[in-house]
Amino acid sequence: SEVEYIAEVGQNAYLPCSYTPAPPGNLVPVCWGKGACPVFDCSNVVLRTDNRDVNDRTSGRYWLKGDFHKGDVSLTIENVTLADSGVYCCRIQIPGIMNDEKHNVKLVVIKPAKVTPAPTLQRDLTSAFPRMLTTGEHGPAETQTPGSLPDVNLTVSNFFCELQIFTLTNELRDSGATIRTA
């Protein structure tokens, strides 16, 4: 089943996906679509690349901000809304019959926490928090089941107040999601 990535309304969501061009620089087409990967191609394409660059984007909110030419095709969705929630398909279209790599990732968009943190605390959930929960772009991460999640005593330096972490943790536990932590 797909891993869940969390983003807060109004922030940027980051959905990791990558491949290793072989040989280096030999890029393959990639498509991102809304909905689980179908048998063929991508449904409801939000972004598509060819062998050189992004050549199709349904909205200016969708970006590949990683090193595209090294195979980092992670999708950034800017200024997310609740409607952006759902499963996304990253399809790496390796030439040949049925050679495509298909990756389903789930974006969970949450409403901003009601508690207003101190001005010094960073509240960019979507850049820092998803990568803390799901470090898909820098190698394997430890997997924790909801039952093993910490309750309140989760220390996140310069990031979130305890109440917000507590609230989010319980939301995740209630949803039964599998959380990956850095």
Partner: antibody, heavy 116, light 107 residues
Framework: EVQLVESGGGLVQPGGSLRLSCAAS????????MSWVRQAPGKGLEWVAN????????YYVDSVKGRFTISGDNAKNSVYLQMNSLRAEDTAVYYC?????????WGQGTLVTVSS | ETVMTQSPAILSVSPGERATLSCRAS??????LAWYQQKLGQAPRLLIY???TRATGIPARFSGSGSGTEFTLTISSLQSEDFAVYYC?????????FGQGTRLEIK
Amino acid sequence: EVQLVESGGGLVQPGGSLRLSCAASGFTFSSYWMSWVRQAPGKGLEWVANIKRGGSERYYVDSVKGRFTISGDNAKNSVYLQMNSLRAEDTAVYYCARGSNWFDPWGQGTLVTVSS
Amino acid sequence: ETVMTQSPAILSVSPGERATLSCRASQSVYSNLAWYQQKLGQAPRLLIYDASTRATGIPARFSGSGSGTEFTLTISSLQSEDFAVYYCQQYNNWPITFGQGTRLEIK
């Protein structure tokens, strides 16, 4: 208006060949996957084959693999289904449809009857 | 392959009433499911894709729901032109497969 028109169906003996054509209009043909779906008389629908934009990849249901060949011609806005070594169980109305996963729209269909 | 099972095979409903058609997949297809309507002697017409998205030009009385293995097509208030055969189709797993169809007839 998007339109698909099939032709080429008819009566053929077992082991024979037939080439179906589908002429497309009203959309940018080269931007879409195209598919063939068939329906045996009084039966349900069966996906047969499809071809990727540009023709770089073609896919077939197992029952026709090695016997049927799908092809496309962007200059003529047409997709074809070459059917060889036809069997009685290939008897069906053959529909041309736009799309790879779901199909919209469909042509009116052309009947292929394989019988001696 | 993924077997799609539709029920009932025949559904008799009066005009103006609600019709509920079911489709079950033998394995998960996420929301990669479409519904088609086919009238006698005509080609199928796409009604719903992605389990719940109405195709262009399809009236609002048609709605789809479900995900995973259980799906439903609902026609809220049957019109005379809605009596036909309805097929579900999955496009999540190889190969693409259709259900055997549900015939919706006038009661």
